[in-house]
């Protein structure tokens, strides 16, 4: 069955998909969609790329990695719930049914709405001190190690640091799984 | 308006190769996968080939390496290469286009052309 | 491969009549929520033309009086009042897996 990940609405999402270039630039056309994968093709294409680059996308849906390197993971700006769903990942590599093909579900849940009382509260709660990583399938999840002591004068830096990383796009209520692979 | 239009038809004899040709016109080519559909004499429709938009490609078990699909997304076009032909597969052939988005069944549809294989 | 038994083999029906041709697959076609499953229609000298798709889609341009519906394995095409033009050899075909297979086809001919 399908890989579960999760968004706030509001939130950027992020959805891996990896294959690896026979060769540097050696590049393999990747289509996205909305929907599960049929069976020759992407579904509602979101966005596609070809042997050189990206040839096609719509707004909010864009790759933020390298795809020169065959990182084609998905990132979707600002989500609603609308866009919660299956997506599927299609590497369409040459050959005789050579294809793979990756359904990927996407849960998005409202926005948390909480009182302001302290600042370091709400950055606890927003960010628990355990992060891990995951890799290509769902048992590969490794820890990251744990947050040291935060004080409030790290709490910016952090955040600003943590907003322009991708690994924020997927940062989760429970345990802040961070996909990367 | 969408048409696709097929010739490379004729006679051959078995064990020999032809080569068909499906001209596509009225929507962007490359966006869809294109199929090739046949059927014999006074039988039902068997599906024997499919390219992907992305060029990956699929066959039955009673084709395989045999026949093989390609495309010119440049000339809009969609090909069939036969080759070890054998009496069974004399065929009416269709070039089919997938439906956008999926693929596996087909919006569209050529006239058909004839291959006959005997001796 | 997904086996596609069509019945009966051929229907015969007077005009204005209703006709219900049937299609089996031997294992499931529901993926996702959606049956892949279609329909097409298919006149003597003529290529096949697709009037259901996802089971119970109607294609543009196809006739109201055409309907598709079932789920699973059982599938069912119905045309509720038959016209003269609608005399032909009825396919349906699998989208689940490769190979693609079409039913063997309903010959509906006038009574």
């Known amino acids: 069955s399908e890989v579960e990940y999760r968004a706030e609405v509001g939130q950027n999402a992020y959805l891996p998909c990896f294959y690896t270039p026979a060769a540097p630039g050696n590049l393999v056309p990747v289509c996205w969609g909305k929907g599960a994968c049929p069976v020759f093709e992407c579904g509602n294409v979101v966005l596609r790329t070809d042997e050189r680059d990206v040839n096609y996308w719509t707004s909010r849906y864009w790759l933020n990695g390298d795809f020169r390197k065959g990182d084609v993971s998905l990132t979707i700006e600002n989500v609603t719930l609308a866009d919660s769903g299956i997506y599927c990942c299609r590497i369409q590599i040459p050959g005789i049914m050579n294809d793979e093909k990756f359904n990927l579900k996407l849960v998005i849940k409202p926005a948390k709405v909480t009182p302001a009382p302290t600042l370091q509260r709400d950055f606890t709660a927003a960010f628990p001190r355990m992060l891990t990583t995951r890799g290509h399938g769902p048992a590969e999840t490794q820890t990251l190690g744990s947050l040291p002591d935060i004080n409030l004068t790290q709490i910016s830096t952090l955040a600003n640091e943590l907003r322009d990383s991708r690994l924020a796009n997927d940062l989760r209520d429970s345990g802040a799984t961070i996909r990367i692979g | 308006e969408v048409q696709l239009v097929e010739s490379g038809g004729g006679l051959v004899q078995p064990g020999g190769s032809l080569r068909l040709s499906c001209a596509a016109s009225g929507f962007t080519f490359s966006r869809y996968a294109m199929s090739w559909v046949r059927q014999a004499p006074g039988k039902g429709l068997e599906w024997v080939a499919a390219?992907?938009?992305?060029?990956?490609?699929y066959f039955p078990d009673s084709v395989k390496g045999r026949f093989t699909i390609s495309r010119d997304n440049a000339k809009n076009s969609c090909y069939l290469q036969m080759n070890s032909l054998r009496a069974e597969d004399t065929a009416v052939y269709y070039c089919?286009?997938?439906?956008?988005?999926?693929?596996?069944?087909?919006?569209?549809w050529g006239q058909g052309t004839l291959v006959t294989v005997s001796s | 491969d997904i086996v596609l038994t069509q019945s009966p083999a051929t229907l015969s029906v007077s005009p204005g009549e209703r006709a219900t041709l049937s299609c089996r697959a031997s294992e499931s076609v529901e993926y996702y929520g959606t049956s892949l499953m279609q329909w097409y229609q298919q006149k003597p000298g003529q290529a096949p033309r697709l009037l259901i798709y996802a089971a119970s889609n109607v294609e543009s341009g196809i006739p109201a009086r055409f309907s598709g519906s079932g789920s699973g394995t059982d599938f069912t095409l119905t045309i509720s009042s038959l016209q003269s033009e609608d005399f032909a050899v009825y396919y349906c075909q699998q989208s689940m897996k490769v190979p693609l297979t079409f039913g063997g086809g309903t010959k509906v001919e006038i009574k």
């Open positions: 089919a286009r997938g439906r956008e988005a999926d693929g596996g069944y087909f919006d569209y």
């Open positions: 390219i992907s938009s992305g060029g990956s490609l």
